[in-house]
Amino acid sequence: SERCDDWGLDTMRQIQVFEDEPARIKCPLFEHFLKYNYSTAHSSGLTLIWYWTRQDRDLEEPINFRLPENRISKEKDVLWFRPTLLNDTGNYTCMLRNTTYCSKVAFPLEVVQKDSCFNSAMRFPVHKMYIEHGIHKITCPNVDGYFPSSVKPSVTWYKGCTEIVDFHNVLPEGMNLSFFIPLVSNNGNYTCVVTYPENGRLFHLTRTVTVKVVGSPKDALPPQIYSPNDRVVYEKEPGEELVIPCKVYFSFIMDSHNEVWWTIDGKKPDDVTVDITINESVSYSSTEDETRTQILSIKKVTPEDLRRNYVCHARNTKGEAEQAAKVKQKGNGCTEPMTL
């Protein structure tokens, strides 16, 4: 047979679906690997073939499309399960071919069990919403294409295990869930259960979104350096250990890159001959404000080290800050730090 362009196992698409629910899985070839769509390929005489490898097996086998009630079917570039079973877990391959051309890609499909409170090994999308912001809406995700627009499904929303009824600031509105002036107590897993009829059967789709309430953009600030500061003097004798914490507060800013670094006499620690250790720790507030601490330590400080200029720097998307540490030698009358 002719050579086939094998894109291998597309682990970027770790598809997870719930057991005993419908699942529609598009062939990734047309979404990520090829320049044309299924319709173009089909009209050019190319055929889409599906096969799979069961979990913990090496043998590729064709998918059985002759199961009772068409439990597994293919429609254009979509593989349908109505519904899934636990042993459908495995690596699935879609191959596009004719007599002169072949391209294929595999992807893992995991069928996941859930309990009555929707707890499972499923990875949920995270939706960040700003604290005290007016209204935030989340939409029941990944339900497009399961039923025609003429079908009006029933939708029930839950927070954790509790159906959302008479929640003071959370309002279910069909596929949408609205949050009014959200607070940190609104954090949690929100699940929509969509029920729709098809060919005399009722199917359920369960989708969960993790809501995380974060700091508001109106509260966003440049970094604030708590330490070092002008009130604390690091007074040491030669031979002692010098430990200076650089403690910086970063208000939450969506997609901000928060940085903290030290300079010694204007150079990065790696560029000086001093034997310096720097340890970093990070903690977060309930609204994901970040406190980043970088501890600079010199095991046995020399008189020269005590004359150096130690400056803590910080940066986020709102701006930069810097603060020099006041370092002096014990018993030495000079208290003035080197000027920047």
Epitope: H133, G134, I135, L183, S185
Partner: antibody
Framework: EVQLLESGGGLVQPGGSLRLSCAAS????????MSWVRQAPGKGLEWVSA????????LYADSVKGRFTISRDNSKNTLYLQMNSLRAEDTAVYYC???????????WGQGTLVTVSS | EIVMTQSPATLSVSPGERATLSCRAS??????LAWYQQKPGQAPRLLIY???TRATGIPARFSGSGSGTEFTLTISSLQSEDFAVYYC?????????FGQGTKVEIK
């Protein structure tokens, strides 16, 4: 200095309407959520309504839902409470208060008295 | 909604003595609890937020403690200006709710 000054209170008959205003100064009004809190004569404090800093989100106590409407005009630094279908049990001093999730109601106005009586 | 219960309803204390006021929430409010002081004819004034942080300008004799469902406001040495009604309030969940108040009166 943060200042909140309520106005618009008075005597009104049951079923009547009243509009309260709260003029804010001394802070960036558009950065803060605002609330109305009331206190019936000789009673405790009761939260009535809240509005988000951007004016989009509003919340109400069950006792006033459907009758009261909170709004704000950030260009005028003013908070409003439109009270319709007033009842005798709405008689109270109405306070406007600034709120933050981090600090609760950190500043209050001096209050305006609403009396609902025939 | 979360019900806040304060005790005692009235507390009779002599000036210079310590006063301890309690507040219980019907479910956990984390540390999202505030204390207010109200004198006759005046608006409430924020004393404590975050269960234990003193608001700006509040004297050190006022302190708050607790988390979850049990909270305490302590006035270490009552001054004449401290005789008033004190309210606790949770701001963890909407609707934000107040306790019924504790009146601190001169013994």
């Amino acid at each position: 200095e943060v200042q909140l000054l309520e106005s618009g209170g008075g005597l009104v008959q049951p079923g009547g309407s009243l509009r309260l205003s709260c003029a804010a100064s001394g802070f960036i009004f558009s950065h803060y959520g605002m609330s109305w809190v009331r206190q019936a004569p000789g009673k405790g404090l009761e939260w009535v309504s809240a509005i988000s800093y951007d004016g989009e989100g509003t919340l109400y106590a069950d006792s006033v839902k459907g009758r009261f409407t909170i709004s704000r005009d950030n260009s005028k630094n003013t908070l409003y409470l439109q009270m319709n279908s007033l009842r005798a049990e709405d008689t109270a001093v109405y306070y406007c208060a600034r709120f933050r999730y981090y600090t609760a109601f950190d500043y209050w106005g001096q209050g305006t008295l609403v009396t609902v009586s025939s | 909604e979360i019900v806040m219960t304060q005790s005692p309803a009235t507390l009779s204390v002599s000036p210079g003595e310590r006063a301890t006021l309690s507040c219980r929430a019907s479910q956990s409010v984390s540390s999202n609890l505030a204390w207010y002081q109200q004198k006759p004819g005046q608006a409430p004034r924020l004393l404590i937020y975050g269960a234990s942080t003193r608001a700006t300008g509040i004297p050190a004799r006022f302190s708050g403690s607790g988390s979850g469902t049990e909270f305490t406001l302590t006035i270490s040495s009552l001054q004449s200006e401290d005789f008033a009604v004190y309210y606790c309030q949770q701001y963890n969940n909407w609707p934000w709710t107040f306790g019924q108040g504790t009146k601190v009166e001169i013994k």
